[in-house]
Each structure stands twice: as C-alpha cells, then as structure tokens.
C-alpha cells in the first residue's frame, strides 16, 4: 500500500518551506509557478493528482532531491519535460496517454536497469507503458488516453 498524507487545509503558499516527507496537493485546482521551486527538501512523495495540470514547470521540481514518487494521475498532461523524465530514480504515477512518450524515450535512453514503466487507465488499472504506447500511439494514431482494453500489468 502506498503511503498517504492529508492535504494542507489552507491555501498553498509556494514561499512556504514544507518540512514533511509527504505532501498532498491533490484536487486543489493548482497552477504551478513557472519560475519558482517548491521548497520541500525532505519530501519523498508529492501528490499533485487531479489538478488539471497540462505542463510541468521543470524549475518547480528542481530542488526536490529526495523525491521518490510523483503522483500526476488525473491531469491532462500534454508532455513530460525531459529533465524531469531523466530523473531515473523518480517513480511517476500518470494516466496512460501519448504525452508520456517523451518520458518513456528519455528513460529508455538514459536509465539502465529500470523496472518497467507503468501508467494507469481510467479504471485505475496499471499498464506497461511501453505496451500502451506501442498500441495506442503509433505514428498516425490520434492522441489517446487509457481505456480498459489494454493488457493488465501484474
């Protein structure tokens, strides 16, 4: 079972120094600052799920050296920045989408000995990202998001 933590009850101030090992900003309708880093030097798990995020400003994640899990589920991502993808030790939780192609390519080219990358469909089933991209994002296919008919990853 993945660890969890509750949301801060107040509005998020990006100037705050967060001391916790887990931060939950899910479902807050947040927009991430473009030129400011999240100040959370202890954080292992950052939950940004359900915020309608399309872009991930790379500066925002720059100082999160301890980050292990980044939950981006239920965000309509248009792409994943290469610098973020190149963090080989970062576990990304994201919806199955062709926008993850860049993430997959950067990992494949830069990170050796990795466990298979996964993505999640609308029913919360895990899929092998490589298999999903092959089936759903071949050249000429329209951008796809995950649905229930791909192989279930065990």
């Amino acid at each position: 079972q993945e660890p969890s933590c509750t949301m801060p009850s107040t509005d998020v101030d990006w100037n705050t120094e967060f001391s916790a090992t887990c931060l939950n900003f899910s479902g807050r309708g947040l927009s991430l600052p473009l030129n400011q880093s999240l100040r959370a030097s202890n954080v292992l798990l950052l939950d940004l799920s359900g915020n309608g995020l399309r872009e991930l400003p790379v500066t925002f994640f720059a100082h999160l050296q301890k980050l292990e899990v980044l939950n981006l589920l239920h965000n309509p991502l248009s792409r994943v920045d290469g610098a973020l993808a190149a963090r080989c030790d970062l576990d990304l939780r994201a919806d199955c989408s062709c926008a993850l192609e860049s993430w997959h390519e950067v990992r494949r080219d830069n990170c050796s000995g990795q466990k298979p990358l996964l993505c999640w469909d609308t029913t919360s089933f895990q899929h092998n990202l490589s298999a999903f991209l092959e089936v759903s994002c071949a050249p000429g296919l329209a951008p796809a998001t995950g649905s229930g008919h791909h192989h279930h990853h065990h």
Epitope: Q1, E2, P3, T6, C22, N24, L44, E68, V69
Partner: antibody
Amino acid sequence: QITLKESGPGILQPSQTLSLTCSFSGFSLTTSGMGVSWIRQPSGKGLEWLAHIYWDDDKRYNPSLRSRLTISKDTSSNQVVLKLTNVDTADTATYYCARRARDYYNSGHWYFDVWGAGTTVTVSS
Amino acid sequence: DVVMTQTPKSMSMSVGERVTLSCKASENVGTYVSWYQQKPDQSPKLLIFGASNRYTGVPDRFTGSGSATDFTLTISSVQAEDLADYHCGQTYSFPFTFGSGTKLEIK
C-alpha cells in the same frame, strides 16, 4: 546479508565528546534513497531519534540536540560516525544505528528496516 | 515535534489471546507510522511500515491499521515468543519521534 554494528567508548566523563561509529555491510551509502540514522534508548525508556545522513551527504538533526551533534559518513570504509559534544549523565543510553533504504516496490515510504545490536554508553564522573 | 502516545504502558496476556496496542499522534502524520518489536536485550526489529504494511518475514498474526492520528497494532493470537516491548514511530516530519513503548508480558 545486511548488517550494522555500532562501536563506542563504553564509559566517558561529563563534558567529554562522545564518538560513535556505525560500520555496515551488505549495502552502499551511495545508492539513491539510502541513509543511516542514529537512535538512542536510555535503559527502560523509549527510543529517541538523533540524526540522519543521506546518500547525497545531506544531514538532518534533532533540534533538541542540534548544537551538540555532528553526523558524517565515509562511504569508502562503509562507516557513519556520530559525535555528541559536552556529554552529561542524561546521555547515558544504548545507541543504535539503523538503515533507511528505498524499496523500489514501496517507494515513498520511510522506515528503518535493519538495526545494529547497539552500543551501551555510560556517562559518569 | 509530533508526540506519539502509546497505550497501555504494559499488558499481560495469555497465549492465544488477541492483543491490541494503541498509538496516537499529536498531529496528522498520514500513514507514516512504523511498529517495531524489541525483545529483551535485543535491538528493535521492524514489524509494520506505512501503518499497515507487514514487513518481509513478519508472521501474519501481526496487523497494523490506522491513519492520520490513530494507529493500532493487533496480534491476532499471541504467542510466547511475542514477549517484547512494542514501539510506534512517525517518519512524517523531522524530528522523527517514537512512543514510549508498550511492554507485552505473557501469563
């Protein structure tokens, strides 16, 4: 097999500096997510976390002892050293080092999976 | 600092009985709580992490539950070898803190 073993002076006098060494094997303190903490336990009492050192040499300390504590690592000899200055009888305890490892199938968790047997430290005049 | 309060301080149970140990945090720590077993003259050993995940090799009679501020360690059918002190600890925020422990004695 993963092991940690603490060593220290056993007995020392008030105002002296306590130096403790944690020698470990079976893992590398250069691996991402890896770290070692020092935790102490006065006889018959609970556990008190003292300090942690990360794989990237980042350090965290218990604020109540921050001014007296220094943690360091020597990755080539697989050792972590804790120094506690100006000791008092209240520092008499068993001192443990414990490992925090990243479990790639349980990422984001923080727990101490392996502990040393402990070393007993007595501060007495 | 987060204060972890364990109850009871000690308890005496017969083999086969169900044991429930409580740990309360002074503030919300999510599921960042671990349970450790410390047998006499030994170092602590990890039983449960993430409030409810049983560590490798731990017998399935040990179960952890809870989140936020209230946590429980349950031993479904206590055995003679379970004689030990049990410690809960939080790793949600620095400084990490532990409860004062519960001593389990076997009748």
